[in-house]
């Protein structure tokens, strides 16, 4: 969490941002809140990016003002206009790309004063893994697949029964570049699995951590997966 305060002159206002991650090829949110004002026409929101000459986005007098917008953000940005009055200056970014990563500044002017806060925005790819029993294999084998990751993640297997065991000798992980030549498909195979056990396939890079669990019994197979972003630090 980054909390910024205003600059000299007028009173300062508190602006709060949260470091976040964008999944390339999807819309992303750059989070920013501020002390609200009672009059929308008195609020100015400016989003800036380090190393970019033009503005990322500007909202003033109750509407978008995009005449100074940088070309790389043209057609891609929006604030939540109906939520500005309650102090939400968050930015929606369409079709996040790797090049969108960097340091952004959320700069606010209201009748109460000015304030700003920086935000570190990471971009990459992350997806939910799916773990299945590989019936084509000669021995009991599990196959963990996740369609899109970047940067290249690490893959670690764990089991409920053999807690703390190292499965690197009985697993094999491969990374296959996807057609857009950025993200990769992750495939990890675990050999010699035993029945009545729960296995977890954990995929992690510096942006996200995802886990796919599978419980194999003689009568059924149960699966569960979840994904967690790692860098949600507020400022």
């Amino acid at each position: 969490l980054i909390i910024g305060f205003g600059i000299s002159g007028r009173h300062s206002i508190t602006v709060t941002t949260v470091a976040s991650a964008g999944n390339i090829g999807e819309d992303g949110i750059l989070s920013c809140t501020f002390e609200p004002d009672i009059k929308l026409s008195d609020i100015v929101i400016q989003w800036l990016k380090e190393g970019v000459l033009g503005l990322v986005h500007e909202f003033k007098e109750g509407k978008d003002e995009l005449s100074e917008q940088d070309e790389m953000f043209r057609g891609r940005t929006a604030v939540f206009a109906d939520q500005v009055i309650v102090g939400n200056a968050s930015l929606r970014l369409k079709n996040v790309q790797l090049t969108d990563a960097g340091t952004y500044k959320c700069y606010i002017i209201t009748s109460k004063g000015k304030g700003n806060a920086n935000l570190e925005y990471k971009t990459g790819a992350f997806s939910m893994p799916e773990v299945n029993v590989d019936y084509n294999a000669s021995s009991e084998t599990l196959r963990c697949e996740a369609p899109r990751w970047f940067p290249q993640p690490t893959v670690v297997w764990a089991s409920q029964v053999d807690q703390g065991a190292n499965f690197s000798e009985v697993s094999n992980t491969s990374f296959e570049l996807n057609s857009e030549n950025v993200t990769m498909k992750v495939v990890s195979v675990l050999y010699n699995v035993t029945i009545n056990n729960t296995y977890s396939c954990m995929i992690e890079n510096d942006i996200a951590k995802a886990t796919g669990d599978i419980k194999v019994t003689e009568s059924e197979i149960k699966r569960r997966s979840h994904l967690q972003l790692l860098n949600s630090k507020a400022s």
Partner: antibody
Framework: EVQLVESGGGLIQPGGSLRLSCAAS????????MNWVRQAPGKGLEWVSV???????YYADSVKGRFTISRDNSKNTLYLQMNSLRAEDTAVYYC??????????WGQGTTVTVSS | EIVLTQSPGTLSLSPGERATLSCRAS???????LAWYQQKPGQAPRLLIY???SRATGIPDRFSGSGSGTDFTLTISRLEPEDFAVYYC??????????FGQGTKLEIK
């Protein structure tokens, strides 16, 4: 040259299924938001579905649960699987690329007629 | 659900005249996500304006877009014979994700 070419349209009975294809050239489908938009005879444009670069999909309420958008990255082709077709699905179906600057590339359209 | 309402439904003008087409949204739309298209009979739509006011590649400068919030305008400063067509506005980002207006038919008077 950047181009989209649709195929797969035709005459189909109510309740039937059809798969539309949209072959792309000059750009990579999986890097863009790819859409299907339709136009009923004498009517306006209606958005049908989108698949994001990530593979996430969204649908108009009128087709949700019946239509499925997908792509084959190796063939650089977009698809629309249409099941449980109704008379009101009769339209020209266009695929269109959203390259952040709006729907900037459109196919020529393929006609779907649902009639008994 | 966001609704885009275009007016007038039909606009009858002569070549050389100025055309003003309106698109009104039922709730606020980001200027970045507002586009205009032209469609001629038997053809696919063509992108004219994106980001409410930026001309797409190859679009003549007699076409201009303006507006913000809920009110957007497409202006054709001096009508050419090839400009007579149907025009649609379109938004992105609300529910449904993409929405088109019902269209304005620009016809020769």
């Amino acid at each position: 040259e950047v181009q989209l070419v649709e195929s797969g349209g035709g005459l189909i009975q109510p309740g039937g299924s059809l798969r539309l294809s949209c072959a792309a050239s000059g750009f990579i489908v999986s890097r863009n938001y790819m859409n299907w938009v339709r136009q009923a005879p004498g009517k306006g444009l209606e958005w049908v579905s989108v698949i994001y670069g990530s593979g996430r999909t969204y649908y108009a309420d009128s087709v949700k649960g019946r239509f499925t958008i997908s792509r084959d990255n190796s063939k650089n082709t977009l698809y629309l699987q249409m099941n449980s077709l109704r008379a009101e699905d009769t339209a020209v179906y266009y695929c269109a690329r959203d390259a952040d600057y709006g729907l900037d590339v459109w196919g020529q359209g393929t006609t779907v007629t649902v009639s008994s | 659900e966001i609704v885009l309402t275009q007016s007038p439904g039909t606009l009858s003008l002569s070549p050389g005249e100025r055309a003003t087409l309106s698109c009104r949204a039922s709730q606020s739309v980001s200027s970045s996500y507002l586009a205009w298209y032209q469609q001629k009979p038997g053809q696919a739509p063509r992108l004219l304006i994106y980001g409410a006011s930026s001309r797409a590649t190859g679009i003549p400068d007699r076409f201009s877009g303006s507006g913000s919030g809920t009110d957007f305008t497409l202006t054709i400063s001096r009508l050419e014979p090839e400009d007579f067509a149907v025009y649609y506005c379109q938004q992105y980002g609300s529910s449904p994700l993409y929405t088109f207006g019902q269209g304005t038919k620009l016809e020769i008077k």
